[in-house]
C-alpha cells in the first residue's frame, strides 16, 4: 500500500514529469454542454398578470473543448494558468437545431426594469421611451444560436452609452457569449510538489484570495479547487469543494455513496440541500442575500446587476412556491440533480454531470410600460448540464495504472 501511495503521490501532482500532467493540461475527457430552454407559451397573458406557462425545449448539445494556456510555475509551489473553452454544436446529439426559435423574456428590458425600480420616475419614463423607440418588448422570439452566442441589439449600445461601465457586452448580447473562446479567469493553484495535502487547491483567482461580490467573508472565500481535480486519498468524510467563476462563489458537494464506473471504484458527491438555501434556512448563506425564496441564489452582484438567479433545474430542492408559480415545471431528483463520481485514491473525476438553472426575476415596474401587469415571478430561462465521462484510451490507461497495477503489486 505504501508503494502504491508513493506512485499515486508521484503521479497526481502538477508536474511535467507526472503521469497525470497532460491529463490536467488538456483534459482528455470529452465534455458536453446540454442546454434546455424554457419556451414561454403565453407572453401576452403574462403581461396581463396571468401565470407564466413554459415548455422545456432541448437538449441543444455542444461539445466543449478545454485547454490550458499561459501555464506558469511559480516558486511558492503554485502554478498559474488560463483555461479556454470553445463550444461546437452537435446536431446528432441534439433535439432540435440552433435555428430553432424560442420565446424568452427580454433580459435587457425586464432586467433593466427591476434594476430601475427605485430610480426616479422620470428616468423610468425615459427608459420606456427609449425601449419604444428601439422596438424593445418584454418578450422576444430569438433563435437558440442567438440566445446562446449573442444577437445584435441596439439596446446594448444604448446601455453602454448612457450607463457606461455597467455592462460586459459590446454590440451583442448572449447568455453564453462570455464563455465561448474565452478564459474563466487566471487560476493559481497548488501543484502538490512540496505539499501534497494542498494539491489543486486554489491559491488565487484573478490575483484575488477572496472575491467581493457577497456580504460576508465566508461567502467571499475562494475555497477548494478549480473544479477539475481534487487532492488524493479521499474518504467518505471528504467534501468536494471548488470555486466556480460562473457562479462567482465557492461550492461544496457532499459524499453520497460509493460506486463503480467502468470497473473503477468511485465516490459519488452531490449538492447538499443547503447549497442554494437562503439565509433564514441556512445562516452561513446569509452573505449571498438579499434573498427571495429558498433554493435560488441571487447572482445579480456578479452579473451586471441584472436580477438573475442560479438554482437546480426546475427549482429542485427549492421552496415549492417557485415551481408552482410557473406552469410546466416538474422537478425530478433523477433528471435534475448534479453529481460528480470521483476516483477517491487519485481525486480524479471519472464521470460527472453538473446541472444548473438560470432564471430571471421579473415584475411590473411603474413607469416602465413594457412591463405591463407582470406579477412578480422568478421565471426560468434555461438549464444546462455540463457532463463528461472518462472513456477510450484514457480510461484504459487509468484502469491499468491505478486499478490493475496496484492489485498485481498487492499480491
Amino acid at each position: 500500500p505504501s508503494l502504491i501511495k508513493q506512485q499515486v503521490l508521484k503521479n497526481v501532482r502538477i508536474d511535467p514529469s507526472s503521469l497525470s500532467f497532460n491529463m490536467w493540461k488538456e483534459i482528455p475527457i470529452p465534455f458536453y454542454l446540454s442546454v434546455y430552454f424554457f419556451d414561454v407559451m403565453n407572453p401576452s397573458e403574462i403581461l396581463k398578470g396571468e401565470k407564466p406557462q413554459v415548455r422545456e425545449r432541448g437538449p441543444y448539445v455542444y461539445r466543449e473543448f478545454r485547454h490550458k494556456s499561459n501555464i506558469t510555475f511559480n516558486n511558492n509551489d503554485t502554478v498559474s494558468f488560463l483555461e479556454y473553452r470553445t463550444f461546437q454544436f452537435q446536431p446528432s446529439k441534439s433535439h432540435g437545431s440552433e435555428s430553432d426559435y424560442i420565446v424568452m423574456p427580454n433580459i435587457l428590458v425586464l432586467g433593466a426594469a427591476v434594476m430601475m425600480e427605485n430610480k426616479p420616475m422620470t428616468l423610468k419614463l425615459i427608459m420606456t421611451l427609449a425601449f419604444t423607440t428601439l422596438g424593445e418588448r418584454a418578450f422576444m422570439n430569438r433563435t437558440v444560436g442567438e440566445i446562446m452566442w449573442g444577437y445584435k441589439d441596439p439596446l446594448v449600445n444604448l446601455i453602454n452609452k448612457y450607463f457606461p461601465g455597467m455592462f460586459p457586452f459590446k454590440d451583442k448580447f448572449g447568455l453564453f457569449a462570455e464563455l465561448n473562446n474565452s478564459d474563466s479567469g487566471l487560476f493559481t493553484v497548488f501543484t502538490g510538489v512540496q505539499n501534497i495535502s494542498r494539491i489543486h487547491l486554489v491559491d488565487k483567482w484573478n490575483g484575488l484570495s477572496k472575491v467581493d461580490f457577497w456580504h460576508s467573508d465566508q461567502c467571499n472565500m475562494i475555497n477548494g479547487t478549480s473544479g477539475q481535480m481534487w487532492p488524493p486519498f479521499m474518504t467518505p468524510e471528504s467534501s468536494l469543494e471548488f470555486y466556480s467563476p460562473e457562479a462567482c462563489r465557492s461550492m461544496k458537494l457532499m459524499y453520497k455513496e460509493s460506486g463503480v464506473f467502468e470497473g473503477i471504484p468511485t465516490y459519488r458527491f452531490v449538492a447538499p440541500k443547503t447549497l442554494f438555501a437562503n439565509g433564514s434556512i441556512y445562516p452561513p448563506n446569509e452573505g449571498f442575500c438579499p434573498c427571495l425564496e429558498s433554493g435560488i441564489q441571487n447572482v445579480s452582484t456578479c452579473r451586471f446587476s441584472a436580477p438573475l438567479f442560479l438554482s437546480h433545474p426546475h427549482f429542485l430542492n427549492a421552496d415549492p412556491v417557485l415551481a408552482e408559480a410557473v406552469t410546466g415545471l416538474h422537478p425530478n431528483q433523477e433528471a435534475h440533480s448534479l453529481f460528480l463520481d470521483i476516483h477517491p485514491v487519485t481525486g480524479i473525476p471519472m464521470n460527472c454531470s453538473v446541472k444548473l438553472q438560470l432564471s430571471l426575476y421579473m415584475k411590473s415596474v411603474a413607469g416602465i410600460g413594457q412591463t405591463g401587469k407582470i406579477e412578480p415571478v422568478v421565471l426560468p430561462l434555461l438549464w444546462f448540464a455540463e457532463s463528461g465521462a472518462m472513456e477510450g484510451e484514457t480510461l484504459h490507461t487509468f484502469y491499468t495504472q491505478l486499478v490493475l497495477m496496484p492489485k498485481v503489486m498487492h499480491y
Epitope: 427605485n118 430610480k119 426616479p120 420616475m121 425615459i126 452609452k161 450607463f163
Partner: antibody, heavy 116, light 110 residues
Framework: QLQLQESGPGLVKPSETLSLTCTVS????????WSWIRQPPGKGLEWIGN???????DYSPSLKSRVTISVDTSKNQFSLKLSSVTAADTAVYYC??????????WGQGTLVTVSS | QSVLTQPPSASGTPGQRVTISCSGS????????VNWYQQLPGTAPKLLIY???QRPSGVPDRFSGSKSGTSASLAISGLQSEDEADYYC???????????FGTGTKVTVL
C-alpha cells in the same frame, strides 16, 4: 425642427397661483417627456418637474406640495401651476423636452415676477 | 434640495484650456451620468455634453467631459471669446428623486 414656446402672465400677486403653458410645435407631445425648469434672476437652474403624455408626473421634492403639471395632447401643450407663490418664486420659467440625453430642447423662457 | 457644487467662476485667455469641476455624491453623480449645459448671456441653456462625455451634433470638439467617482469635469480647450457663458452640470439624484443642477460656473475670456 422642434420648438417650445412658453406663455402666461408675467406678473402674479403673492399667495396666488402662477399658471404657464408650453406649446410644442414641430413634433408630437406623445414622443418624449416634458419639463419645467426655472432660474431666479442672477441665480442657477432649478428643476420643477416633468410630465409624460399619459399624465404621469414627477416633481421636485422641494416644490411638490405646490406644483401641478398637466398635459393636453390634443393641443400639443403642457402646463404648469404653482400655488401660494411668494417673491422667492420670481424667476425665468423654461419649458424643455427631456430625453435620455438630457434637456435637449428649451423654450426661450418667460419671466414671471411675483409682486403685489 | 441638494445641488452639485461648481466653482463660481473660471477664466482664461483665448486659446487656453479651462476646466470646470462638478462635485456630487454617491446618490447623484456616483450612480448617474452627467450632462453639461451652456447658457450664453440672455439666452436659454443649451445641451453641451450628455452621458459624461458625449457631444451632441454641432458642439465643437474643443468641449469635452469626463467623470470619476462622484465628480465630473468639463474641459474647454482652445478657449474662444464666444465660449463666455454660464456652464451648469446636471445629474439624476436617487435620494430626492429627480434632476439636480450644479451651482453654475461663469467662464470669462480675458
Amino acid at each position: 425642427q422642434l420648438q417650445l414656446q412658453e406663455s402666461g402672465p408675467g406678473l402674479v400677486k403673492p399667495s396666488e397661483t402662477l399658471s404657464l403653458t408650453c406649446t410644442v410645435s414641430g413634433g408630437s407631445i406623445s414622443d418624449d417627456l416634458w419639463s419645467w425648469i426655472r432660474q431666479p434672476p442672477g441665480k442657477g437652474l432649478e428643476w420643477i418637474g416633468n410630465i409624460y403624455y399619459s399624465g404621469i408626473t414627477d416633481y421636485s421634492p422641494s416644490l411638490k406640495s405646490r406644483v401641478t403639471i398637466s398635459v393636453d395632447t390634443s393641443k400639443n401643450q403642457f402646463s404648469l401651476k404653482l400655488s401660494s407663490v411668494t417673491a422667492a418664486d420670481t424667476a425665468v420659467y423654461y419649458c424643455a423636452r427631456l430625453t435620455l440625453r438630457g434637456f435637449q430642447n428649451w423654450g426661450q423662457g418667460t419671466l414671471v415676477t411675483v409682486s403685489s | 434640495q441638494s445641488v452639485l457644487t461648481q466653482p463660481p467662476s473660471a477664466s482664461g485667455t483665448p486659446g487656453q484650456r479651462v476646466t470646470i469641476s462638478c462635485s456630487g455624491s454617491s446618490s447623484n453623480i456616483g450612480s448617474s451620468t452627467v450632462n453639461w449645459y451652456q447658457q450664453l448671456p440672455g439666452t436659454a441653456p443649451k445641451l453641451l455634453i450628455y452621458s459624461n462625455n458625449q457631444r451632441p451634433s454641432g458642439v465643437p470638439d474643443r468641449f469635452s467631459g469626463s467623470k470619476s467617482g462622484t465628480s465630473a469635469s468639463l474641459a474647454i480647450s482652445g478657449l474662444q471669446s464666444e465660449d463666455e457663458a454660464d456652464y451648469y452640470c446636471a445629474a439624476w439624484d436617487d435620494s430626492p428623486n429627480g434632476v439636480i443642477f450644479g451651482t453654475g460656473t461663469k467662464v470669462t475670456v480675458l
